[in-house]
């Protein structure tokens, strides 16, 4: 497994280890910052972001932010630490493998945000209600 001389050095904020000594590679996320988007009135959309980045820190997760105002629609894709708010909102769904969009209250625009923790999971953003875990039927399926 991990050589002992390496293991001694892994206790810093850039490294996450498990009980078996495995080391977590940082998340791979789509990272195009803010781009104009054509994603509108769809159950799900692809980010159309061609840049996949290795997140800077292993605790970071993938985030997508969809915004619509009178002038345009934008989609933001980034890595972010779920311990810290993003756009003043807590990343409640950071452990989710899928990026399920949740609407947030922002004056003057429609604002949706999602976060997730599987590789490149912010490439496919999901608006459809059928994925929403507040749906009791879905919860039944998940926990069966």
């Amino acid at each position: 497994t991990i050589p002992p001389h390496v293991q001694k050095s892994v206790n810093n904020d850039m490294i996450v280890t498990d009980n078996n000594g495995a080391v977590k590679f940082p998340q791979l996320c789509k990272f195009c910052d803010v781009r104009f988007s054509t994603c509108d009135n769809q159950k799900s959309c692809m980010s159309n972001c061609s840049i996949t980045s290795i997140c800077e820190k292993p605790q970071e997760v993938c985030v997508a932010v969809w915004r619509k105002n009178d002038e345009n629609i934008t989609l933001e894709t980034v890595c972010h630490d779920p311990k810290l708010p993003y756009h003043d909102f807590i990343l409640e769904d950071a452990a989710s493998p899928k990026c399920i969009m949740k609407e947030k209250k922002k004056p003057g625009e429609t604002f949706f945000m999602c976060s997730c923790s599987s590789d490149e999971c912010n490439d496919n953003i999901i608006f459809s209600e059928e994925y929403n875990t507040s749906n009791p039927d879905l919860l039944l399926v998940i926990f069966q």
């Epitope: 497994t1 991990i2 078996n20 495995a22 977590k24 996949t52």
Partner: nanobody
Framework: EVQLLESGGGLVQPGGSLRLSCAAS????????MAWVRQAPGKGLEWVSR????????YYADSVKGRFTISRDNSKNTLYLQMNSLRAEDTAVYYC????????????WGQGTLVTVSS
């Protein structure tokens, strides 16, 4: 038993090139993601690059993007790291590592090969 054996390190001048190899055995190499990680003297680990099992999708840390190229030859069970335009700050021990289950957790590491960039 899983074994990873790195080679190809050495002393090189700034601006020079090196090609690291990692010979893998004890597992089905073609089924696992692989990565290169480095540790500079007195510093922590830094992830350098990762390659998917199919060899097509590759990922790089910003510090090496455009200079380093990761590749693999699944028929030879070997992982490579081509390092060009080397800088003093690339001086480190370079390790190859094997993904546990395509989930970003790397459970087996080689013993490392030292790359020294100095004039």
């Amino acid at each position: 038993e899983v074994q990873l054996l790195e080679s190809g390190g050495g002393l090189v001048q700034p601006g020079g090139s090196l090609r690291l190899s990692c010979a893998a055995s004890g597992f089905t190499f073609s089924e696992y993601d692989m990565a290169w990680v480095r540790q500079a003297p007195g510093k922590g680990l830094e992830w350098v690059s990762r390659i998917r099992s199919d060899g097509v999708r590759t990922y790089y840390a910003d510090s090496v993007k455009g200079r380093f190229t990761i590749s693999r030859d699944n028929s030879k069970n070997t992982l490579y790291l081509q390092m060009n335009s080397l800088r003093a700050e690339d001086t480190a021990v370079y390790y190859c590592a094997k993904d546990r289950a395509k989930n970003g957790w790397f459970d087996y590491w080689g013993q490392g090969t030292l790359v020294t960039v100095s004039s």
